[in-house]
Structure formats: structure tokens, C-alpha cells
């Protein structure tokens, strides 16, 4: 069998809402993956599991099942959404994300994703992780790759 390539493209959109009383931020983050099947037979994308971390704390998880199949030598782009919650114990985040005098409220999040594919009863897992900028202050749609955090060092959070 040839490889199945998974490429995390980036954040596609982030939609923000707030709970004023709980000083909590809700971020629905939609990400884009490219999955390429380099084989001469179809493969199933059985599931995608994803989690989002801020400052080493997991703030959101998602799992998609029975997603799609990818034909021989084909590629599919898949969007998946991770609902995240930045809760009261990080209230300094609420202060920053709701600061109305500044326009962009970028925070650095670590996106982790694992894709499970199957073919002929065989299962394979491919994982990726990437730091991304996300604006926690307003609804934002990104051009693909626009939100990438380019610092190779782990950001100090």
C-alpha cells in the first residue's frame, strides 16, 4: 500500500459568542484538512478526532465518524468544527477577547487532529498538530493558511 497523506491546511473560520455572567467565551473553530489517497484503490475516512489546546489546557474536542471515502489517487478537502470553551478560570482571556478598543484579538491555539482511515480491513492513524492564530474577539473567516502561527518555538502562554 502507498501512503495516505493528511495535510492540516488551517483555520477556515472562527465564530465567537460570550456568556457575560459566566465571563466565558465560546469559539466554534472550523478547520480544513486535505486528505490524499495515493493508492490504486479506495479508502474510507472512518473518523477524525480533534482537540484544541490553549496554554496546555484542552479547551475543545470533536469527533466525526463515517466521514467519506476517497477514490484511487484522489484527494478530498474536509472541514471539521471544534466547539471550544474558554471558561471563567481564564477570566483574563475574557478581558482581552472583549476589549473593544482594539480590533484584532489574536490568541495562539494548538490544533491537534488524528485521521483514521481504513482499507481492506486495515486501519491506519495519522496525526498532526499545529499552532494557529485565532481571533477570539469577533467572527472571522480566514484565507487558507492565513492563521498560521509561524514561530517554531512553543509560544509562552
Amino acid at each position: 500500500p502507498r501512503s495516505i497523506d493528511v495535510k492540516y491546511i488551517g483555520v477556515k473560520s472562527a465564530y465567537v459568542s460570550y456568556d457575560v455572567q459566566k465571563r466565558t467565551i465560546y469559539l466554534n473553530i472550523t478547520n480544513t484538512l486535505n486528505i490524499t489517497n495515493n493508492n490504486y484503490y479506495s479508502v474510507e475516512v472512518e473518523n477524525i478526532t480533534a482537540q484544541v489546546q490553549f496554554a496546555k489546557t484542552v479547551i475543545g474536542k470533536a469527533r466525526l465518524n463515517n466521514i467519506t471515502h476517497i477514490g484511487p489517487l484522489d484527494m478530498k478537502q474536509i472541514d471539521y468544527t471544534v466547539p471550544t470553551v474558554i471558561a471563567e478560570e481564564m477570566s483574563y482571556m475574557y478581558d482581552f477577547c472583549t476589549l473593544i478598543s482594539i480590533k484584532v484579538h489574536n490568541i495562539v491555539l494548538m490544533m491537534q487532529v488524528t485521521v483514521t482511515t481504513t482499507y481492506f480491513g486495515h486501519s491506519e492513524q495519522i496525526s498532526q498538530e499545529r499552532y494557529q492564530y485565532v481571533d477570539c474577539g469577533r467572527n472571522t473567516t480566514y484565507q487558507l493558511g492565513q492563521s498560521e502561527y509561524l514561530n517554531v518555538l512553543q509560544p509562552q502562554q
Epitope: Y18, V20, R23, Y92, D95, F96, T98, I100, I102, H105
Partner: antibody, heavy 120, light 112 residues
Framework: DVQLQQSGAELVRPGASVKLSCTAS????????MYWVKQRPEQGLEWIGR????????ENAPKFRGMATMTADTSSNTAYLQLNSLTSEDTAVYYC?????????????WGHGTSVTVSS | DVLMTQTPLSLPVSLGDQASISCRSS???????????LEWYLQKPGQAPKLLID???NRFSGVPDRFSGSGSGTDFTLKISRVEAEDLGVYYC?????????FGSGTKLEIK
């Protein structure tokens, strides 16, 4: 190093117009709001309005609507304030200002101000 | 517009004294997101204003801890615990919760 460089002093006739500039260095204005503030001689501060340079969206104090127009040119990283139909009441120092922040640090930056004198 | 009323207009103090400046807004300046965007600026002669305090009580970076802000709703206070010569100038409160944002009329802190 973040700086807001404002254009030089202006002496203008009543009824004329003037366009003030504020050129930013050290940051890209499209990612930040730019604000304008007026201060008449020996008087207090008045908030004129703000502009989002990325899309040109503006919010003005009602008092300045029609007579103060804010624009921006992201290619030159410059914000502009055009003042129309000037009267002696518009003799003032005009400041541009912005606020730049990340999660850990927010800074407030002001230009040195442009003095506008309206006199015949 | 939200009217910001500052008192007193002039505040003569001796160095080392405590100074207190009041600011009252004509309506609540609690933003819909729950935050109160009340700020205090100091302007020295011939200079642009400098931000001292934002969101009622948060001291801005580099501002000495002798400055403190308090208040809620419509009534706010700036206190300087021990006035130093470098503190002299005009203090302005500012509300950034409701457009158009507005400044108070200013309080001149001067030596007795």
C-alpha cells in the same frame, strides 16, 4: 518601535479645508483601529471618531459628522483626517491615536499632534 | 452622548498629599459584554495624553501603584496616594463603552 508621525502645523482660512495625515511605523494599520482626538487651546479633549483602515468603516461623534472625514491608505500605512468648512472653533491640536495589544500586553500610542489654526 | 462630569476642575495639593478626582457619567457605562470601559489619562503641558488606568481600576503598564481607580455604574474615582511633582497636569476620565466615546472636562492637579 511603534510610532505615529503626524503632518506639520497648518494655517488655513475660514471656510477652507485641510487634510491631516498620521503615518504609522512598527505595525500594520489594517489590523488596528485608528482614532482622532481634538483639543482646542486651553481646553479639554474631544473624541472625533475612529476608522477601521482595512475596510474604511468609520464611527464619528455626531458633532463632527459632515465636517470631519476619516480615511486611510493601507499601502502607505497612513490615516487621514479631512476637516471641511473650517471656522475659528476648529483651531486646535488634532491627535491620532491607536491601541495595540496582545493577550499579555496592551499599549496606547499617540501622535505628537497637528496644530491647525483657522484665521483670516 | 454620554456626558462625563469631572470634579473638581482644579485640585491644589501639597507634594506627598493624597489626591482624589471624581468622574460621573450621565448613564451607565457598562458595555453589553459586561465590561466597564472607564479610563483615566494624564496630560502634561505640551504633551499628548498618557493612559494611566483602563477598565476602571487596571493600571496601565509602567504606571506607579500610587495611582488607583475605583467605582462602578456611573460613579468613578481616581486616587493618587502620595502626589509627586511628576504627577502634576490635567487628568481626564474617558468612557469607551458607548459610541461616541467621550472625555470628561478635565481636572488640573497643581501645587498649593
Amino acid at each position: 518601535d511603534v510610532q505615529l508621525q503626524q503632518s506639520g502645523a497648518e494655517l488655513v482660512r475660514p471656510g477652507a479645508s485641510v487634510k491631516l495625515s498620521c503615518t504609522a511605523s512598527g505595525f500594520n494599520i489594517k489590523d488596528y483601529y485608528m482614532y482622532w482626538v481634538k483639543q482646542r487651546p486651553e481646553q479639554g479633549l474631544e473624541w472625533i471618531g475612529r476608522i477601521d483602515p482595512e475596510d474604511g468603516d468609520t464611527e464619528n461623534a455626531p458633532k463632527f459628522r459632515g465636517m470631519a472625514t476619516m480615511t486611510a491608505d493601507t499601502s502607505s500605512n497612513t490615516a487621514y483626517l479631512q476637516l471641511n468648512s473650517l471656522t475659528s472653533e476648529d483651531t486646535a491640536v488634532y491627535y491620532c491615536t491607536t491601541r495595540i495589544g496582545n493577550l499579555y500586553h496592551v499599549m496606547d500610542y499617540w501622535g505628537h499632534g497637528t496644530s491647525v489654526t483657522v484665521s483670516s | 452622548d454620554v456626558l462625563m462630569t469631572q470634579t473638581p476642575l482644579s485640585l491644589p495639593v501639597s507634594l506627598g498629599d493624597q489626591a482624589s478626582i471624581s468622574c460621573r457619567s450621565s448613564q451607565s457605562i457598562v458595555h453589553s459584554n459586561g465590561n466597564t470601559y472607564l479610563e483615566w489619562y494624564l496630560q502634561k503641558p505640551g504633551q499628548a495624553p498618557k493612559l494611566l488606568i483602563d477598565k476602571v481600576f487596571n493600571r496601565f503598564s509602567g504606571v506607579p501603584d500610587r495611582f488607583s481607580g475605583s467605582g462602578s455604574g456611573t460613579d468613578f474615582t481616581l486616587k493618587i496616594s502620595r502626589v509627586e511633582a511628576e504627577d502634576l497636569g490635567v487628568y481626564y476620565c474617558f468612557q469607551g463603552s458607548h459610541v461616541p466615546f467621550t472625555f470628561g472636562s478635565g481636572t488640573k492637579l497643581e501645587i498649593k
